[in-house]
């Protein structure tokens, strides 16, 4: 018995070959002997049953001369899964058609971090097929009648080529995934005290009409609880602020990409935030983490202090030195001090390995004079 695979809604070609490689009489039947179509010697395709009953069934007249009499079934339905009989040259060929349906749950447009389940359904009792989907960038996911893709990333978007294999017979189908998310899962901004701060949240997808709502929650390092800094709506890509905290006085752009500015980087704002975006007609939310590290350099009485506030890594080093001189203090901690600093230009650097994350300069006028 020959096996043919077909996807619901598409077409399948069931083979039937003559040994003499020339035109001959043939008949395609269902397993209950009802005639589907055939050729009875005049080179004319004769259909069985009523026209509407068999309008999905056809053959390739152009192939008859070569001794090939395939049965073409268009717009495949699940109930087409059965055995078909081709009668020719006093013999019967049995062809089994397995029609499968592919369902994507919850769909092919998902949010970053969500999972996709691809299910093959069929009303024929076939043994487990092998299903394999390959992304154009090389990622491969495989399963049987159920294939799962978890924790989807923006880079999983685009076309996937999927193959269903059963008894060495293959059928392929494509799926286009759209994974909506931010370009970066997390970002960190380093600023000197008093500088303006920019937070940008570019989306990694473009849609014609983007509608939803969002909020930025902020957990300051020095605060015991988080605070909602801003809430906003998004309609057809236009941002409108609903509510904004009075401290800090944030400004938000009305065009995408989502963009926020803080008038000043102050120690009390150092910390981390979480921007959430809920999109219309989508369950779940998009998230982007943003971190603010603030550097403060000050001279008070007889001591020069450099301090960083906010989420720094333990590998980061804070260095305080006179410009063009060797480091005076360099430690893997968040505060460094020099007592009785010499007059001149001092520099504080926050670095990780050989990479300087930020630096701040201060002019020390004379010992014991306040200067910030």
């Amino acid at each position: 018995k020959t096996l043919v695979l077909g996807k619901e809604g598409e077409s399948a070609e069931l083979p039937c070959e003559s040994s003499q490689k020339k035109i001959t009489v043939f008949t395609w039947k269902f397993s209950d002997q009802r005639k589907i179509l055939g050729q009875h010697g005049k080179g004319v395709l004769i259909r069985g049953g009523s026209p509407s009953q068999f309008d999905r069934f056809d053959s390739k007249k152009g192939a008859w001369e070569k001794g090939s009499f395939p049965l073409i079934i268009n717009k495949l339905k699940m109930e087409d899964s059965q055995t078909y009989i081709c009668e020719l040259e006093n013999r019967k060929e049995e062809v089994e058609l397995w029609v499968f349906k592919v369902t994507f749950s919850p769909g092919t447009s998902l949010l970053q971090g969500q999972s996709l389940t691809l299910t093959l359904d069929s009303n024929s009792k076939v043994s487990n097929p092998l299903t394999e989907c390959k992304h154009k960038k090389g990622k491969v996911v495989s399963g049987s009648k159920v294939l799962s893709m978890s924790n989807l990333r923006v880079q999983d978007s685009d076309f996937w080529n999927c193959t269903v294999t059963l008894d060495q017979k293959k059928n392929w189908f494509g799926m286009t995934l759209s994974v909506l998310g931010f370009q970066k899962a997390s970002s960190i901004v380093y600023k000197k005290e008093g500088e303006q701060v920019e937070f940008s949240f570019p989306l990694a997808f473009t849609v014609e009409k983007l509608t939803g709502s969002g909020e930025l929650w902020w957990q300051a390092e020095r605060a015991s609880s988080s605070k909602s800094w801003i809430t906003f709506d998004l309609k057809n890509k236009e941002v409108s602020v609903k509510r904004v905290t009075q401290d800090p006085k944030l400004q938000m752009g009305k065009k995408l990409p989502l963009h926020l500015t803080l008038p000043q980087a102050l120690p009390q704002y150092a910390g981390s935030g979480n921007l959430t975006l809920a999109l219309e007609a989508k369950t779940g939310k998009l998230h982007q983490e943003v971190n603010l590290v603030v550097m403060k350099v000050a001279q008070l009485n007889n001591t020069l202090t450099c301090e960083v506030m906010g989420p720094t890594s333990p590998k980061m080093r804070l260095t305080l030195k006179q410009e063009n001189q060797e480091a005076r203090v360099s430690e893997e901690q968040k505060v460094v001090q020099v007592v009785a600093p010499e007059t001149g230009l001092w520099q504080c650097l926050l670095s990780e390995g050989d990479k300087v994350k930020m630096d701040s300069r201060i002019q020390v006028l004379s010992r014991g004079v306040n200067q910030t």
Epitope: Q196, K235, S240, K254, K255, H259
Partner: antibody, heavy 119, light 107 residues
């Protein structure tokens, strides 16, 4: 061809009211953001009020908030500015302006209508 | 509201001169800034949008640059018809705000 035609200006006493209209044609009025901009005699330009094309949200300069109301009638392709509790400092030429499709500036302006607030 | 500081407030120049007008925003506004030209008794005219894009029909001697907080309008070679008042406008968010204007006069 895009056209914006303001009307409704005139002389009004302090504390009085006036409604300006801006008849628009030549573009999809319902989806375009629109604004009112004014210019006091011999002074610079001041943005007064705006209405979003996508969601109909309304926005105002602090100087007119609570006194002016911007609105639109999509069936008539007309933008309005309802001005109440008028003050002498509201005396200006009022322009209606159309924003570019992607909110990048005002690409078309009306000819302006003069509002004079005086007793 | 975001403040826009434009300078100079007035400027005298001759035909053929290269002229630069600057605008500074009190907040970072990306490139959400436009430049307008206004002649006496006339409505303003958009010259530059999105900080550096030339509006259709505007001569190429006009150019804009900058992003964040500092912006510049440059007229590479002044023509007699360029003597007018120029304004910058931030359209980063509402309420929109104009600069105070720069009056460009013939020297």
């Amino acid at each position: 061809e895009v056209q914006l035609l303001e009307s409704g200006g005139g002389l009004v006493q302090p504390g009085g009211s006036l409604r300006l209209s801006c008849a628009a044609s030549g573009f999809t009025f319902s989806t375009n953001a629109m604004s009112w901009v004014r210019q006091a005699p011999g002074k610079g330009l001041e943005w007064v009020s705006g209405i979003s094309g996508s969601n109909g949200n309304t926005y105002y300069a602090d100087s007119v908030k609570g006194r002016f109301i911007i609105s639109r009638d999509i069936s008539k392709n007309t933008l309005y500015l309802e001005m109440n509790s008028l003050r002498a400092e509201d005396t200006a030429v009022y322009y209606c302006a159309k924003e570019r499709d992607n909110w990048n500036g005002f690409d078309y302006w009306g000819q302006g209508t003069l509002v004079t607030v005086s007793s | 509201a975001i403040q826009m500081t434009q300078s100079p407030s007035s400027l005298s120049a001759s035909v053929g001169d290269r002229v630069t007008i600057t605008c500074r925003a009190s907040h970072v506004i990306r490139n959400d800034l436009g430049w307008y030209q206004q002649k006496p008794g006339k409505a303003p005219k958009l010259l530059i949008y999105a900080a550096s894009s030339l509006q259709s029909g505007v001569p190429s001697r006009f150019s804009g640059s900058g992003s964040g907080t500092d912006f510049t309008l440059t007229i590479s070679s002044l023509q007699p018809e360029d003597f007018a008042t120029y304004y910058c406008l931030q359209d980063y968010n509402y309420p929109y705000t104009f600069g105070q204007g720069t009056k460009l006069e013939i020297k």
